[in-house]
């Protein structure tokens, strides 16, 4: 049973090398891959290893978030001598192996990208048989998902002293700029909270006091596009109605 060193060196390709006399593990991943939400992306990962002509059982794993301990999003296993890596796990069915692990390629395709996929991903290969060894990328590849703005919520809420306030929440990458327009407002960026903690792609803008009845429009814009939505405020004897 042999292991190889985990000392890491990197170049611009994030090549990670473990070496000891006459042995070498390395993994090559790009620092970042960019793609638009809804599209597909390829996460490249190739490796070298010290076990010449290894054709025993192997497993290919991709995980998200952090190396070694992050949740697995994809896993496949190839039997001894087989070039077919049988998928055992594909989160939401959106992950598919493009590369051939027998040819030192673990490249992964991610379908139907969402903003939530914007994370760092780590590839790992495991040998089990006469050879007992494994290697995992420590630095991984950042998947940068871009998206045109989308307004996910717009609402009118009561606030103290029989007043009303409006909230608009949008998502996008880059995070969109929000603007309100409406009766006696012109364009306003009042009380923009950007981005919400723990929700890196969400931006919220608040109009703290709606003083006039009428239509209030929230516009979200970034370099990829714009989106707008409206609410209507009508006060009938202290009641309010809002529609989008």
């Amino acid at each position: 049973f042999v292991r190889t060193k985990i000392d890491t060196t990197e170049n611009l390709l994030n090549t990670e090398v473990h070496s000891s006399p006459a042995q070498r593990w390395s993994m090559q991943v790009p620092p970042e891959v960019s793609a638009e939400a809804g599209d597909a992306a390829v996460l490249p990962c190739t490796f070298t290893h010290p076990h010449r002509h290894y054709d025993g059982p192997l497993t290919a794993i991709w995980r998200a978030g952090e190396p070694y301990a992050g949740p697995q999003v994809f896993r496949c296993a190839a039997a001894r001598g087989s070039e077919l890596c049988q998928t055992a796990l594909s989160l939401h069915g959106r992950f598919r192996l493009l590369g051939n692990p027998r040819r030192n390629d673990l490249s992964l395709r991610v379908e139907r990208l969402a903003l939530a996929d914007d994370r760092r991903y780590f590839c790992r290969v495991e040998f089990a048989g006469d050879v007992h060894d494994r290697y995992e990328s420590r630095h991984g590849v950042r998947l940068h998902v871009t998206a045109a703005p989308r307004i996910v919520n717009i609402s009118v809420l009561p606030s103290p002293a029989h007043a009303f306030r409006a909230l608009c929440t949008a998502e996008g990458e880059p995070p969109p700029a929000l603007a309100w327009s409406g009766p006696a407002l012109g364009n306003s960026l009042a009380a923009v909270r950007s981005p919400r903690e723990g929700h890196g792609h969400l931006v919220t803008a608040e109009l703290p006091a709606l003083t006039h009845d009428g239509r209030y429009t929230c516009t979200a814009a970034n370099s990829l596009g714009r989106s707008e939505a409206s609410v209507y405020l009508f006060r009938f004897h202290g009641a309010s109605g809002a529609s989008t």
Partner: antibody
Framework: EVQLLESGGGLVQPGGSLRLSCAAS????????MSWVRQAPGKGLEWVST????????YYADSVKGRFTISRDNSKNTLYLQMNSLRAEDTAVYYC???????????????WGQGTMVTVSS | DIQMTQSPSSVSASVGDRVTITCRAS??????LAWYQQKPGKAPKLLIY???SLQSGVPSRFSGSGSGTDFTLTISSLQPEDFATYYC?????????FGQGTKLEIK
């Protein structure tokens, strides 16, 4: 809740058999290698056995090879250790443990059961 | 088999102290080393994996370092709940082996 729960321990005579079970919950059981680790009273930790996520690869400490068999039922999220030809020196608390982030090996054990006591004595 | 040797076997310290425990492998194990904490009657708890990665939920006063054959677990400022036994473990090759343990006691 992510947890492991062992059962099946007890008092057994030398030469006897016992089967330990470990019920897993809160994680994708088949994605991870699982192990048994034991601890004799007042002593340190000793690795016993590991099984791959799919169950196709098993590994044993020399001290139990040929006597103990590790297995798993992924449909029941359960790990087993069949212990035969038990000896006094097998007396210990037996823990099941999950491998961190791996289907075949353990880079570390990140989740442990509470342990089950096995006493081998006449 | 790879032997893991911890030192010291026991150490007495006070709350607020900085404590260092070392672990030496009988051969190069790269960074395939983990540290565990165990309290009496309880299962071990993972603190550090792959020599220096802090397990989720473990306080940042715990840190690990080293590669090759020499490794260190450091507790920067001892808290009352840290008094326990600490084990190192190599996962470089099967059989996985543990150090004999270091008991951390209140001075």
């Amino acid at each position: 809740e992510v947890q492991l729960l062992e059962s099946g321990g007890g008092l057994v005579q030398p030469g006897g058999s016992l089967r330990l079970s470990c019920a897993a919950s809160g994680f994708t059981f088949s994605s991870y290698a699982m192990s048994w680790v034991r601890q004799a009273p007042g002593k340190g930790l000793e690795w016993v056995s590991t099984i791959s996520g799919g169950g196709g690869s098993t590994y044993y400490a020399d001290s139990v090879k040929g006597r103990f068999t590790i297995s798993r039922d992924n449909s029941k999220n359960t790990l087993y250790l069949q212990m035969n030809s038990l000896r006094a020196e097998d007396t210990a608390v037996y823990y099941c443990a999950k491998a961190i982030g791996s289907s075949w090996y353990s880079d570390a054990f990140d989740l442990w059961g509470q342990g089950t006591m096995v006493t081998v004595s006449s | 088999d790879i032997q893991m040797t911890q030192s010291p076997s026991s150490v007495s310290a006070s709350v607020g102290d900085r404590v260092t425990i070392t672990c030496r492998a009988s051969q190069d194990i790269s960074s395939w080393l983990a540290w565990y904490q165990q309290k009496p009657g309880k299962a071990p708890k993972l603190l550090i994996y792959v020599a220096s990665s802090l397990q989720s939920g473990v306080p940042s006063r715990f840190s690990g370092s080293g590669s090759g054959t020499d490794f260190t677990l450091t507790i920067s400022s001892l808290q009352p709940e840290d008094f326990a036994t600490y084990y190192c473990q190599q996962s470089y090759s099967i059989p996985y082996t543990f150090g004999q343990g270091t008991k951390l006691e209140i001075k």
